[in-house]
């Protein structure tokens, strides 16, 4: 005997109480594939969660996080508190990045500033809690008499405007 349930499309379930008739999923439930014997219950996006996509008969609701929080985990299963740039989230809340570290986002952890000297370069712009250091040419490149790929601009004498 052929299983009549395989004919039931997404958005329905195979109702054994009614001789394997395909019945529509009840409100607040869905079936995303055909041939289902039950419909799945819709996820609820409440509290810190907000609805990004309403539940339909063929697909589950999709949640997002309210302002001040960001999604974590598969399908936004959790909402984590945002921090300011220059901070990281600890068990005791948002804390400023320690000296020598930075975070340029509202989430994640503080990361160490780039060590320019490891690449043989010098620090062009100092780092802050919110921004990494900017590395520039190596100290040797900046020393007097060092060769340069582009010739230096002609120096102006003080007090003279260009002709």
């Amino acid at each position: 005997l052929q299983d009549l349930c395989s004919n039931c499309p997404a958005g329905t379930f195979c109702d054994n109480n009614r001789s394997q008739i395909c019945s529509p999923c009840p409100p607040n439930s869905f079936s995303s594939a055909g041939g289902q014997r039950t419909c799945d219950i819709c996820r609820q996006c409440k509290g810190v969660f907000k609805t990004r996509k309403e539940c339909s008969s063929t697909s589950n609701a999709e949640c997002d996080c309210i302002s001040g929080y960001h999604c974590l985990g598969a399908e936004c299963s959790m909402c984590e508190q945002d921090c300011k740039q220059g901070q990281e989230l600890t068990k005791k809340g948002c804390k400023d990045c320690c000296f020598g570290t930075f975070n340029d986002q509202k989430r994640g952890i503080c990361r160490p500033w780039t060590n320019c000297s490891l690449d043989g370069k010098s620090v062009l712009v100092n780092g802050t809690k919110e921004r990494d250091v900017v590395c520039g040419p190596s100290p040797a490149d900046l020393s007097p008499g060092a060769s340069s790929a582009t010739p230096p601009a002609p120096a102006r004498e003080p007090g003279h405007s260009p002709q």
Epitope: C42, R43, Q44, G47, V48, F49, S77, M78, Q81
Partner: antibody, heavy 121, light 111 residues
Framework: QVQLQESGPGLVKPSETLSLTCTVS????????WTWIRQPPGKGLELVGY???????SYNPSLKSRVTISIDTSKNQFSLQLNSVTAADTAVYFC???????????????WGQGTTVTVSS | QSVLTQPPSASGTPGQRVTISCSGS????????VNWYRQLPGTAPKLLIY???QRPSGVPDRFSGSKSGTSASLAISGLQSEDEADYYC???????????FGGGTKLTVLG
């Protein structure tokens, strides 16, 4: 199997602060809404408020000015503080888990056994 | 005054079918699933029905729930003496941003 256990003083004087703690065992407190619900003698259930592991809180508007719920994920505990109590705050206080905060659809599905708090001088 | 409205009492004889109603508004029952809880004296409420009509494992199929518009109902068929308890409906309220409850219905099994 997640279990919840309320603890705190059973008697509080009027105008003082009611403080209760709920300890969660057999599961993580990270995720879910952790809820306080109360039931005055012979009456129905009333939501006091809830907290999410990341610190988000929501309180019953009728109690909002007096209530604070906090969470300590390292101890798997959450707590209730209710200020300036009166005899009307006498109730059984239940802590409970709400899985709407954990990708779920059951709602308030796990309850502590409740603790009776009497406000009297 | 509870946000959701239930009759304070209901009764039936063993084997009978009884229903308990629960009335709300568009911000709660009208827009959100309904749960039902059963509470025996001196104990915590126990989830009986979730998402309008779903039974958690261990709850007998004598208990069924339904919802229409801003009202919901709990039906208990084949009434038994141990069904004597308080029954509460509950739903998330979008305006209050939290759960609201009915005032409870005390079910008495006669005879």
């Amino acid at each position: 199997q997640v279990q919840l256990q309320e603890s705190g003083p059973g008697l509080v004087k009027p105008s003082e602060t009611l403080s209760l703690t709920c300890t969660v065992s057999g599961g993580s407190i990270s995720s879910y809404y952790w809820t306080w619900i109360r039931q005055p003698p012979g009456k129905g259930l009333e939501l006091v408020g809830y907290i999410y592991y990341s610190g988000y809180t929501s309180y019953n508007p009728s109690l909002k000015s007096r209530v604070t719920i906090s969470i300590d994920t390292s101890k798997n505990q959450f707590s209730l503080q209710l200020n300036s109590v009166t005899a009307a705050d006498t109730a059984v206080y239940f802590c409970a888990r709400d899985d709407y905060g954990g990708n779920g659809y059951y709602g308030v599905d796990v309850w502590g056994q409740g603790t009776t708090v009497t406000v009297s001088s | 005054q509870s946000v959701l409205t239930q009759p304070p009492s209901a009764s039936g004889t063993p084997g009978q079918r009884v229903t308990i109603s629960c009335s709300g508004s568009s911000s709660n029952i009208g827009n959100n699933p309904v749960n039902w809880y059963r509470q025996l004296p001196g104990t915590a409420p126990k989830l009986l029905i979730y998402s309008n009509n779903q039974r958690p494992s261990g709850v007998p199929d004598r208990f069924s729930g339904s919802k229409s518009g801003t009202s919901a109902s709990l039906a208990i068929s084949g009434l038994q003496s141990e069904d004597e308890a308080d029954y509460y409906c509950a739903a998330w309220d979008d305006s209050l941003n939290g759960w609201v409850f009915g005032g409870g219905t005390k079910l008495t099994v006669l005879g």
